[in-house]
């Protein structure tokens, strides 16, 4: 991407990603330099009759680096520290073309859970305090709670009152989502409130 705005590329932790490189049409490329956070990553000299010379200059990422036939950069077994700014400089006889990228590493969401801190009032109304979580959540994970297609909360937590005398069976669903995955987990208000009711009657005996 040669505009001022870098191309944003998402990578998934542990998987592979390709930063696509576009060549100047019809021009012979002298060499290509790939940079990561302004530090040299690799230096490539293409040859018309034999394999290109590839000099990997960053040993940290070296074993995980590969290049396609068009010299796009492939990075495998992605780590969080691969996040950052990448640039490719293509030098021809007449010009130098710059492509910029921002690589963002995201986690596949895993292990969604709901914890319940609910209480039963003397009028038998059940107040549900539910908290949703996923493993290793970061700022780019969005949580919401839904019931019957309506959003009840835009946070990991949900506080809601449920009265079994006037409410029908109700499921509450937590949805956790980021740019590469989403998970959901549903809980039954009736079941949660019955559990609270059992605890409540046990403590009264």
């Amino acid at each position: 991407q040669s505009s001022l705005t870098p191309l944003m590329v998402n990578g998934i932790l542990g998987e592979s990603v390709t930063l696509p490189l576009e060549f100047p049409a019809g021009e012979k490329v002298n060499f290509i330099t790939w940079l990561f956070n302004e530090t040299s990553l690799a230096f490539i000299v293409p040859h018309e009759t034999k394999s290109p010379e590839i000099h990997v200059t960053n040993p940290k990422q070296g074993k995980r680096l590969n290049f396609t036939q068009s010299y796009s950069l492939q990075l495998s077994n992605l780590k969080m520290e691969d996040t950052g700014s990448y640039r490719a400089q293509i030098s021809t006889k007449t010009s130098a073309k710059l492509s910029s990228y921002t690589l963002r590493i995201l986690r596949q969401l895993r292990n969604i859970q709901v914890t319940n801190h609910s209480q039963l009032f003397q009028n038998m109304t059940c107040e549900l305090h539910l908290t949703c979580s996923v493993e290793d959540a970061d700022d780019n994970v969005s949580f919401r709670w839904e019931a019957l297609g309506n959003t009840l909360s835009s946070q990991p937590n949900l506080t809601v009152s449920w009265d079994p005398r006037i409410s029908s069976e109700q499921d509450y669903t937590c949805i956790a989502e980021n740019a590469v995955s989403n998970l959901s987990f549903s809980v039954s208000a009736q079941k949660l409130c019955e559990d609270v009711k059992i605890q409540y009657t046990d403590t009264k005996m």
Epitope: N140, P156, A179
Partner: antibody, heavy 118, light 108 residues
Framework: QVQLVQSGSELKKPGASVKVSCKAS????????MNWVRQAPGQGLEWMGW????????TYADDFKGRFVFSLDTSVSTAYLQISSLKAEDTAVYYC???????????WGQGTLVTVSS | EIVLTQSPDFQSVTPKEKVTITCSAS???????LHWYQQKPDQSPKLLIY???KLASGVPSRFSGSGSGTDFTLTINSLEAEDAATYYC?????????FGGGTKLEIK
């Protein structure tokens, strides 16, 4: 119905502080996050950050780390924005906006104009 | 951060005309997390369309939204005088949340 009512306009001198309030009604306050958005005169909308109204945890955009603080008083369903060491370039309308389920801003306050001038 | 580029910046249109505003993102965005707002002069912004194509409460059916990936569109089918406003797109999936630069619609 959902309503967000903000405090009135403020005229402040450079270096002073200001605290803008946003009182919510018509929904369970602790179920929906609260965003703050800045609009400088004649300019577009700029997201400042948001606060989780249940945990009190605040997230700030990079340009708003340091002099800007979000806080809550859940007992009165109110979110606050405090700006310290005010500068002329802080002159803007500040909006609170409720965070919807997919991080849309589904309800907005009427805005509070903060003018910083010596 | 994700850059949202709106086009055009400004448009002068006549009533009953069809208007299309585009929002181009610097990275692919899940359609659930792309939203549109309308802001009239001296008023707060108002949610117009959320999750790419869902009309917010009370929004007339002449407004519609579409798109996926990096390219999204707001369409006003038969423009009315009251639609004179600035329109903003916004993404909600990556921190920091970002807005487009706005498209000002003037009614001739």
């Amino acid at each position: 119905q959902v309503q967000l009512v903000q405090s009135g306009s403020e005229l402040k001198k450079p270096g002073a502080s200001v605290k803008v309030s946003c009182k919510a009604s018509g929904y369970t306050f602790t179920n929906f996050g609260m965003n703050w958005v800045r609009q400088a005169p004649g300019q577009g909308l700029e997201w400042m950050g948001w606060i989780n109204t249940y945990s009190g945890e605040a997230t700030y955009a990079d340009d708003f780390k340091g002099r800007f603080v979000f806080s809550l008083d859940t007992s009165v369903s109110t979110a606050y924005l405090q700006i310290s060491s005010l500068k002329a370039e802080d002159t803007a309308v500040y909006y609170c906006a409720r965070r919807g389920g997919t991080a849309e801003f589904d309800y907005w306050g009427q805005g509070t104009l903060v003018t910083v001038s010596s | 951060e994700i850059v949202l580029t709106q086009s055009p910046d400004f448009q002068s249109v006549t009533p009953k005309e069809k208007v299309t505003i585009t929002c181009s993102a610097s990275s692919s965005i899940s359609s659930n997390f792309l939203h549109w707002y309308q802001q009239k002069p001296d008023q707060s912004p108002k949610l117009l369309i959320y999750r790419t194509s869902k009309l917010a409460s009370g929004v007339p059916s002449r407004f519609s939204g579409s798109g996926s990936g990096t390219d999204f569109t707001l369409t006003i089918n038969s423009l009315e005088a009251e639609d004179a406003a600035t329109y903003y797109c916004q993404q909600g999936i990556y921190m920091p949340l970002t807005f487009g630069g706005g498209t000002k619609l003037e009614i001739k």
